[in-house]
């Protein structure tokens, strides 16, 4: 049997059963999540669940830019340092940059400081690029 790889929406890229869209425009975290959802297919701000997934995403983004942080789907909705993925994925893989926590910073971004492989927390109303993900 021939197994066809699922296709992603135009402009999205495929990796290990998921489609990713890197949006190089400015949104706060909640507006970014709304835009992701608007694409249907269960799309959300991206969960990053392994180093392999993180590395693939980082390599893709580095082809566009290397200086701007990017919203991902990790947030702290209760503001109690109880982080969770907006798509419901298990919060097992962690890649915090170390000096991330504290203040009114309850949304996570991929940090450009380590080639997008580590995360930092930031104020959710900050407007920046974002990454969406869905399973086709």
């Amino acid at each position: 049997d021939i197994i066809m790889r699922p296709s992603c929406a135009p402009g999205w890229f495929y990796h290990k059963s998921n489609c990713y869209g890197y949006f190089r425009k400015l949104r706060n975290w909640s507006d970014a999540e709304l835009e992701c959802q608007s694409y249907g297919n269960g799309a959300h701000l991206a969960s990053i669940l392994s180093l392999k997934e993180a590395s693939t995403i980082a390599e893709y983004i580095s082809g566009y830019q290397r200086s701007q942080p990017i919203w991902i789907g990790l947030h702290d909705p209760q503001k109690r340092q109880q982080w969770q993925w907006i798509d419901g994925a298990m919060y097992l893989y962690r890649s915090w940059s170390g000096k991330s926590m504290g203040g009114n910073k309850h949304c996570a971004e991929m940090s450009s400081n380590n080639n997008f492989l580590t995360w930092s927390s930031n104020e959710c109303n900050k407007r920046q690029h974002f990454l969406c993900k869905y399973r086709p």
Epitope: R24, L26, R27, D31, S67
Partner: antibody, heavy 119, light 111 residues
Framework: EVQLLESGGGLVQPGGSLRLSCAAS????????MSWVRQAPGKGLEWVSA????????YYADSVKGRFTISRDNSKNTLYLQMNSLRTEDTAVYYC????????????WGQGTMVTVSS | FMLTQPHSVSESPGKTVTISCTGS????????VQWFQQRPGSAPTTVIY?????PSGVPDRFSGSIDSSSNSASLTISGLKTEDEADYYC???????????FGGGTKVTVL
């Protein structure tokens, strides 16, 4: 052919209201964020408002916030701008513009509709 | 956040003109810059998007660049033609307040 066609402009008194429409054709309207941009006579371009493809998120310039409302009807492929409490400084040609999904870059513009606010 | 352009530039046919667009704060390289051409009585059209990309149909005489050291973007038109006579606007994004920001426009005159 990808096209945007504005309508609804005209002469209105200060304090009055007007609703502009922008009819889109030739593309999947709901997949694109849209903006209104205006240009006062002899002046430069000024961004007014934007709306996401789904209509779930809206954005406004400070100069129109609380007076203008942007909306869209994806079933009719139409973008709207409801303008209330109009002022003389709102006199301008109003353009609708399509934005690229991944970058917000304007790629298609309508031909514009003239709004004149005068007593 | 503001984008400042020269009010006007003029040059002879066949020559090269460069229009600058300087950001008032932050780093202009942080967000994409677009350039629009507007001929009298017409709607704007895009000549450069994403800093240096040309839409199909725009001649390669038009080019865009970013200079982080001067916090400015530039539009260069080489081999100037009479049909290039128009107003040119730069546009970018404000990550703190406004959603979209336009420069004040530059009138290009072909002598």
């Amino acid at each position: 052919e990808v096209q945007l066609l504005e309508s609804g402009g005209g002469l209105v008194q200060p304090g009055g209201s007007l609703r502009l429409s922008c009819a889109a054709s030739g593309f999947t309207f709901s997949s694109y964020a849209m903006s209104w941009v205006r240009q006062a006579p002899g002046k430069g371009l000024e961004w007014v408002s934007a709306i996401s493809g789904s209509g779930g998120s809206t954005y406004y310039a400070d100069s129109v916030k609380g007076r203008f409302t942007i909306s869209r009807d994806n079933s009719k492929n139409t973008l709207y701008l409801q303008m209330n409490s109009l002022r003389t400084e709102d006199t301008a040609v109003y353009y609708c513009a399509r934005q690229q999904p991944f970058t917000d870059a304007f790629d298609i513009w309508g031909q514009g509709t003239m709004v004149t606010v005068s007593s | 956040f503001m984008l400042t352009q020269p009010h006007s530039v003029s040059e002879s046919p066949g020559k090269t003109v460069t229009i600058s667009c300087t950001g008032s704060s932050g780093n202009i390289a942080n967000n994409y810059v677009q350039w629009f051409q507007q001929r009298p009585g017409s709607a704007p059209t895009t000549v450069i998007y994403e800093d240096n990309q040309r839409p199909s149909g725009v001649p390669d005489r038009f080019s865009g660049s970013i200079d982080s050291s001067s916090n400015s973007a530039s539009l260069t038109i080489s081999g100037l033609k009479t049909e290039d006579e128009a107003d040119y606007y730069c546009q970018s994004y404000d990550s703190s307040n406004l959603y979209v920001v336009f420069g004040g426009g530059t009138k290009v005159t072909v002598l």
